[in-house]
């Protein structure tokens, strides 16, 4: 029998390589049973996670899972860092693993992207 606890499916030690100036959606996959929980995003600053109050967020519903999305319109160099989503469920706070954004500033980026950047931006691969 599947648990009816809320689960936040951000992968442990996950990372994203993204370009400053591009739009980007950071997804927090949320599993719940009946009532959709209240979910928020925060950005890690040392050991504290600072709640992102005035940022655009949205929900995307799929058959077996929902996604609470943090929108970057566009990505800025200071968006670099680690993020976490949290859900309030039956007066419990459930925290996800943190996920790290590595922002490449196009102005300072060298012409040839690194192998990691190529892998995470497959449209750069001409195969």
């Amino acid at each position: 029998k599947e648990s009816c606890d809320v689960q936040l499916y951000i992968k442990r030690q996950s990372e994203h390589s993204i370009l400053a100036g591009d739009p980007f959606e950071l997804e927090c996959p949320v599993k719940y049973c009946a009532n959709r929980p209240h979910v928020t995003w925060c950005k890690l600053n040392g050991t504290t996670c600072v709640k992102l109050e005035d940022r655009q967020t949205s929900w995307k519903e799929e058959k077996n899972i929902s996604f609470f999305i943090l929108h970057f319109e566009p990505v800025l160099p200071n968006d670099n860092g680690s993020y976490r989503c949290s859900a309030n469920f039956q007066s419990n706070l459930i925290e996800s693993h943190s996920t790290t954004l590595y922002v490449t500033d196009v102005k300072s980026a060298s012409e040839r992207p690194s192998k990691d950047e190529m892998a995470s931006r497959p449209w750069l691969l001409y195969r």
Epitope: Q7, Y9, K11, R12, Q13, S14, E15, H16, S17, H97, K115, D116, A119, S120, R121, P122
Partner: antibody, heavy 120, light 112 residues
Framework: EVQLQQSGAELVKPGASVELSCTAS????????IYWVKQRPEQGLQWIGR????????KYDPRFQDKATLTAEISSNTAHLQLNSLTSEDTAVYFC?????????????WGQGTSVTVSS | AVVMTQTPLTLSVTIGQPASISCKSS???????????LIWLLQRPGQSPMRLIY???KLDSGVPDRFTGSGSGTDFTLKISRVEAEDLGIYYC?????????FGGGTKLEIK
């Protein structure tokens, strides 16, 4: 049932490249990580790196940074390991490994391995 | 990189007797989430490795309870209370806390 089916044995010439594949069944690779591990004859295990198939992001052991390239295709539920500029040191069995389940994501299921022999 | 040191290199044990393998890491494996990402694997002759234990002490399903894992920080131990013939092979520890991930050098369990 979770399974990782790896491509067949390869005999390749020094200096050439080779691409190995690992097709998953019983789970979606986008929900986990895929690790690759090298085992030279009669030796221990070496972690090559990992890919997050959901976004293509890779992490490598620095020793393999210029040797290996990891890719994944969610549509076919398949991960790939490309090895370039092959030498006799690359003669080994290469395993793909599932990066485990939520919430721990520690390697659990292993493929059967692909033997790569580098010889002229 | 974190160095994982396993001892002994080879272990020769009579069936029915206990066995113990040590794994020491050069850095603390306690992660910031409070978990310790240390696993034990067994590679039987001619086979792929299989996971026996994860998070130091949690037994994988189907693994007999004669296997126990213990330890914390940098010192870890795998114990087999009574060795059986099917236990022969090479045992590896692996850390999943730090990058790059690293394996111990392996301990070969032989049956006397």
């Amino acid at each position: 049932e979770v399974q990782l089916q790896q491509s067949g044995a390869e005999l390749v010439k020094p200096g050439a490249s080779v691409e190995l594949s690992c097709t998953a069944s019983g789970f979606n690779i986008k929900d986990t990580y895929i690790y690759w591990v090298k085992q030279r004859p009669e030796q221990g295990l070496q972690w090559i790196g990992r890919i997050d198939p959901a976004n293509g992001h890779t992490k490598y052991d620095p020793r393999f940074q210029d040797k290996a390239t990891l890719t994944a295709e969610i549509s076919s539920n398949t991960a790939h390991l490309q090895l370039n500029s092959l030498t006799s040191e690359d003669t080994a069995v290469y395993f793909c490994v599932r990066g485990g389940d939520h919430p721990y994501y520690v390697m659990d299921w292993w493929g059967q391995g692909t033997s790569v022999t580098v010889s002229s | 990189a974190v160095v994982m040191t396993q001892t002994p290199l080879t272990l020769s044990v009579t069936i029915g007797q206990p066995a113990s393998i040590s794994c020491k890491s050069s850095q603390n494996l306690l992660d910031s989430d409070g978990k310790t990402y240390l696993i034990w694997l067994l590679q039987r002759p001619g086979q792929s490795p299989m996971r026996l234990i994860y998070l130091v002490s949690k037994l994988d399903s189907g693994v007999p309870d004669r296997f126990t894992g213990s330890g914390s920080g940098t010192d870890f131990t795998l114990k087999i209370s009574r060795v059986e013939a099917e236990d022969l092979g090479i045992y590896y520890c692996w850390q999943g806390t730090h990058f790059p991930r690293t394996f111990g050098g392996g301990t070969k369990l032989e049956i006397k």
